[in-house]
Amino acid sequence: FNISGCSTKKLLWTYSTRSEEEFVLFCDLPEPQKSHFCHRNRLSPKQVPEHLPFMGSNDLSDVQWYQQPSNGDPLEDIRKSYPHIIQDKCTLHFLTPGVNNSGSYICRPKMIKSPYDVACCVKMILEVKPQTNASCEYSASHKQDLLLGSTGSISCPSLSCQSDAQSPAVTWYKNGKLLSVERSNRIVVDEVYDYHQGTYVCDYTQSDTVSSWTVRAVVQVRTIVGDTKLKPDILDPVEDTLEVELGKPLTISCKARFGFERVFNPVIKWYIKDSDLEWEVSVPEAKSIKSTLKDEIIERNIILEKVTQRDLRRKFVCFVQNSIGNTTQSVQLKEKRG
């Protein structure tokens, strides 16, 4: 199809080489309820669409995304050619940063309902650049945590070094929906609830004498509980003796509950004590068996191919540790009688 009639938007993604970060493009077509596709004035860069197109409109929620190759080749369907780009309804998610993401991206509705709709499309010219020598040492992260039940704030990474007074007007989106009343470089959250978790996008306009473009950053916001003040506790084994049959295989499970920690480095391991000696046992990898906002239960098994007489003289010790401290539980094997 002819893309010369598409409205055009220029975007800049300046990514940090130090952190993983994502990016999104919205298909900013006009809302179908407000007009029949493109039959309304285009938005100037200073205007903000009332909210994103097609959101909440089932029949029009699907759009087609293409990339325009720089060599003039025909448009390429994003889904076929770019595994690191994911389409979700009207949004295109870039999972990895890199200058190779620069280019022209075109979206249009899948359902073309009338001859007028053919020209209903948006062309987004995306420029991707690595951040130059950390222009600001303490720029906000693209991953931000909010502590449940307390106050918090979400900062726009590309503007976090500017004071509120200097900051340009910012347009914020949460999970693809415009937050029309939030216009500063920092959103204040009066009290953090779980619904504050999500993907936030902040946009502002930058201009030079020739043209203007939208600078965009994406922030993944996670709601968390406060770091635990407790060392982990061992849920299993509970008993310090275990009846076993000689010559038979045996698996002993150690399950431990670790309270939430923002920087989480859980340790769960088995070691064996035999008279004055003790050594760590090479056992299968630990696995998380239950994870909630407040804590995580991790399990690690020790496997004996067959129980020997020597094993009855040993103590099998499960050792668990977090940043607060450690806990151990030892198990002595006892031969089953009869």
Epitope: E50, G56, S180, V181, E182, D190, E191, Y193
Partner: antibody, heavy 121, light 111 residues
């Protein structure tokens, strides 16, 4: 008993100022509420004016038409809410209600009985 | 600011009738919507919060539904004490649960 009581209403000339108060009793502002002002012109509907968060952020929120002329504030020690109204116009004539959000049932679960403000020369 | 549009502005009904009032938000507010009842000379009373939850002490003949931009308040069988004015309200502002803009109201009168 949990209640809100507005005061400070009365007759004021156009261009004049007035400060409304809302005394809260039976609960503490420390529990972090949105305390708000809503007005109702005679025979008309409810109109949101402004809100303030009584928690540490002290965030304030205003209807677009109220920005610049009206200021909401609070005194935690007196558990009192205020609305400073400047450059008053005839169209500001209304009963002004003080209301508190309900932390569970999102919305205004508690209302005062209102105070009448008349702007007239 | 979000605009809330209610319809109809007034309706006449009889005791026992099923009454439906609609409210439309100018942008999606998910389910952050409250409904109030106001009788002459009184402060409003919260009926429904979070679009469909009944506030404490409110009779079960009142119900709310909807999400996004379109919402409905239904009175399944109108009682004499239900003749009043009803308002919808957005209860979210940016990222905070601040009750704010009201609809213009629907007056329910006796037929």
């Amino acid at each position: 008993e949990v209640q809100l009581e507005e005061s400070g209403g009365g007759l004021v000339q156009p261009g004049g100022s007035l400060r409304l108060s809302c005394a809260a009793s039976g609960f503490s502002f420390n529990n972090n509420y949105y305390m708000c002002w809503v007005r109702q012109a005679p025979g008309k509907g409810l109109e949101w004016v402004a809100c303030i968060y009584t928690g540490s952020t002290g965030s304030t929120y205003y209807a677009n038409w109220a920005k610049g002329r009206f200021t909401i504030s609070k005194d935690l020690s007196k558990t009192t809410l205020y609305l400073q109204m400047n450059s008053l116009r005839a169209e500001d004539t209304a009963t002004y209600f003080c209301a508190r959000d309900d932390k569970v049932e999102h919305g205004y679960g508690l209302w005062g009985q209102g105070t009448l403000v008349t702007v007239s020369s | 600011d979000i605009q809330m549009t209610q319809s109809p502005s007034s309706l006449s009904a009889s005791v026992g009738d099923r009454v439906t009032i609609t409210c439309q938000a100018s942008e999606s507010i998910d389910n952050w919507l409250a409904w109030y009842q106001q009788k002459p000379g009184q402060a409003p009373k919260l009926l429904i919060y979070s679009a469909s939850n009944l506030a404490s002490g409110v009779p079960s003949r009142f119900s709310g539904s909807g999400s996004g931009t379109d919402f409905t308040l239904t009175i399944s069988s109108l009682q004499p004490e239900d003749f009043a004015t009803y308002y919808c309200q957005s209860t979210f502002y940016g990222v905070n649960p601040v009750p704010n803009a009201f609809g213009q109201g629907t007056k329910v009168v006796i037929k």
